[in-house]
């Protein structure tokens, strides 16, 4: 049936970037400006996404593919295809309903997005803490206490806090 239909249906010959125009005896017409068709055989073209406000254009719309948006500086994408933009916070913070709040003691966030997470529990793996955690950094686990030579100190103070500038995700 599928093969028979494709032989009889002139619309199946319309490539991506065109649509099968019922008003013109099913001739393949190019998609009008600001619209696209990403597959062949379509009877209409889809309207291009517009990246407005906090969204900015990452990839322009073409006759065969939709526009892609990302977020303006200070915001990051959320959801499939960057359906939302969410405010960035500083490292060591998380976004709450009341805005950006510092991570509580024992938690960290080394990115400008996402939540504060508990420091890794090194003892879970039989290790010890090699470098203390901060608001901006997880602990670094080291060898198990048994692996350390007597009198050796296991814990290193955290590296000075800096803004490593994570790429927006």
């Amino acid at each position: 049936f599928e093969r028979t239909r494709s032989l009889q249906d002139p619309c199946s010959n319309c490539p991506a970037g065109t649509f099968c125009d019922n008003n013109r005896n099913q001739i393949c017409s190019p998609c009008p400006p600001n619209s696209f068709s990403s597959a062949g055989g379509q009877r209409t073209c889809d309207i291009c996404r517009q990246c407005k406000g906090v969204f900015r254009t990452r990839k322009e719309c073409s006759s065969t593919s939709n526009a892609e948006c990302d977020c303006t500086p200070g915001f990051h994408c959320l959801g499939a295809g960057c359906s939302m933009c969410e405010q960035d916070c500083k490292q060591g913070q998380e976004l709450t309903k009341k805005g950006c709040k510092d991570c509580c003691f024992g938690t960290f966030n080394d990115q400008k997005r996402g939540i504060c997470r508990p420091w890794t529990n090194c003892s879970l793996d039989g290790k010890s803490v090699l470098v203390n955690g901060t608001k901006e950094r997880d602990v670094v686990c080291g060898p198990s206490p048994a692996d350390l030579s007597p009198g050796a100190s296991s814990v290193t103070p955290p590296a000075p806090a800096r803004e490593p500038g994570h790429s927006p995700q």
Partner: antibody, heavy 119, light 107 residues
Amino acid sequence: QVQLVQSGAEVKKPGASVKVSCKASGYTFTSYWINWVKQAPGQGLEWIGNIYPSDSYTNYNQKFKDKATITADKSTSTAYMELSSLRSEDTAVYYCTRDYGSAYSYSLWGQGTTVTVSS
Amino acid sequence: DIQMTQSPSSLSASVGDRVTITCRPSQDISNYLNWYQQKPDKTVKLLIYYTSRLRSGVPSRFSGSGSGTDFTFTISSLQPEDIATYFCQQGDTLPYTFGQGTKLEIK
């Protein structure tokens, strides 16, 4: 014993998708980041992204954001990476790795999965 | 992204030689620098983490040093089983990046 076991080699046609799996055993799967790393033939290592299985929070290298989708199934202690719209340049060995008690280094590596894209 | 410049790209040395590999990130990464060994069979192993910390079970002939933007990996006395490619990797800033690798061969 603590290990990551990856799925077998795949041969795919351009435009297809592939889903590579990474089964963890011998440790608490939800407590460690799983990373995915690409090694193209004769090339170095490239970090694709990672996932924290406890809440499925992901990070991606911007370069792979439209190529890779990383997921995790807590019930089977398995992480997955799906690669879409395959092209010849996606031909590579893909490794899953586990962090060394924080996301900053990788103490455990899977054996690698070879993905070949060829028409 | 932070670029990791690793040198040399390949080297040939004799058993017992002291071998040194350098890694220079394009920006300060504090001490978040790790070294990996990839054997010819493609298996990968973490040798050194946080610049200088030797992973347990790794022979003491391997060592690392440095900070900021200049790091060194040393094998004090090369052994036949050390034939491999060695990679540095920064864990300071997303996306985490690797050096291009140093292929080590025995003379």
